[in-house]
Interface confidence: low
Amino acid sequence: LIIGFGISGKHFITVTTFTSAGNIGEDGTLSCTFEPDIKLNGIVIQWLKEGIKGLVHEFKEGKDDLSQQHEMFRGRTAVFADQVVVGNASLRLKNVQLTDAGTYTCYIRTSKGKGNANLEYKTGAFSMPEINVDYNASSESLRCEAPRWFPQPTVAWASQVDQGANFSEVSNTSFELNSENVTMKVVSVLYNVTINNTYSCMIENDIAKATGDIKVTDSEVKRRSQLQLLNSG
């Protein structure tokens, strides 16, 4: 969470950004809010990126002005125009690329004053894991798969019954490059598992942490997955 203050004569407004992460190949949002101003035509929003000449996006007089937009963002950006008057300056970024990572500035000018705040935008790939009973294994095993990760994550297994156990000796993890030659498919197999237990497959890189749980009893299999972005305010 970053809060910036701007001063215009005696007038300043608070601008707030949130560190966030983009999943490459998907759409992302760079979050920015400011003190609302009901005079839409008096609001100017500018998004800038460190190291890039030209603007990422500009919104003024109630509409987009892309005359100074840098070519790497052409056709890929939009603000939530209907939410600008209530103080939402967030930027929608289509088809997130690895190169979109960096420091962005959200600059706001309204009839009340002006202000800005920076945010760090991380890019990578992250996806939910799925755990299955591997019926085709020679011994009872679980297979954890997640289709898209970048950078290469770490994978760890945990068990509700054997809390604190080190499963590295009885698991095997592989990373398979996907067709676009950036992201990778993660596959981890845990061997010699027992019934009446809950196992967790945890996949983590510096952008996200995902956990898949599987509860195996003598009469049922239940699954649950969750994904958490790291260092996002």
């Epitope: 799925e130 009973v133 019926y135 085709n136 294994a137 020679s138 011994s139 009872e140 598992v193 027992t194 019934i195 195996v216 003598d218 009469s219 049922e220 299999v221 239940k222 699954r223």
Partner: antibody
């Protein structure tokens, strides 16, 4: 040729017992999980029970839990279904099927009739 | 338990027709959906596994699609041997459940 062959079906009175067998051939039986699926006359398919390759995981449908027992003998390449306390609603054709990507190999079925 | 609902329950069509059967799960099953064909007096036969993967030996006129809760089996050009009953089945979690079946008849 990959094959599953069920046997052991027949006519039994309510409350009685039967043991179905499924003989596997043409593949490494010990590497695959197995299922039992049944089909009542004129009705659809109903999953009954599953067992994993080394018998570590066993699952049952609620309708048979406590009455049916699935087991396997990998040395004999055979799957079993022990059925106790049989009811009229257990009347069906019972199929064994191999657990792979879907139930990819099925037996021809054996008929169980529960009637007095 | 996850309920699987197929539609239609029965369907009349002619040789050469394109036919679509749908299957809806009562909650998400990701792509854990299989399709089977059954002819009278015979065991079911696996056609499609994991929602869209054609089982080895199955003609390419059969195809599957969908994920989450809504799935489709399509036969692009009906052949005489395709008249049968079709079942969907989820393998996401126990109890593994089948749809009630769709009977495909000759018009």
């Amino acid at each position: 040729e990959v094959q599953l062959l069920e046997s052991g079906g027949g006519l039994v009175q309510p409350g009685g017992s039967l043991r179905l067998s499924c003989a596997a051939s043409g593949f490494t039986f010990s590497s695959y999980g197995m299922h039992w699926v049944r089909q009542a006359p004129g009705k659809g398919l109903e999953w009954v029970a599953s067992i994993s390759s080394s018998s570590g995981y066993i699952y049952y449908a609620d309708s048979v839990k406590g009455r049916f027992t699935i087991s396997r003998d990998n040395s004999k390449n055979t799957l079993y279904l022990q059925m106790n306390s049989l009811r009229a609603e257990d009347t069906a054709v019972y199929y064994c099927a191999r657990a792979s990507s879907g139930m990819d190999v099925w037996g021809q079925g054996t008929t169980v009739t529960v009637s007095s | 338990d996850i309920q699987m609902t197929q539609s239609p329950s029965s369907l009349s069509a002619s040789v050469g027709d394109r036919v679509t059967i749908t299957c809806r799960a009562s909650q998400t099953i990701r792509s854990y959906l299989n399709w089977y064909q059954q002819k009278p007096g015979k065991a079911p036969k696996l056609l499609i596994y994991a929602a869209s993967h054609l089982q080895s030996g199955v003609p390419s006129r059969f195809s599957g699609s969908g994920s989450g809760t809504d799935f489709t089996l399509t036969i692009s050009s009906l052949q005489p041997e395709d008249f049968a009953t079709y079942y969907c089945q989820q393998s996401y979690t126990t109890p593994y459940t089948f749809g009630q079946g769709t009977k495909l008849e000759i018009k």
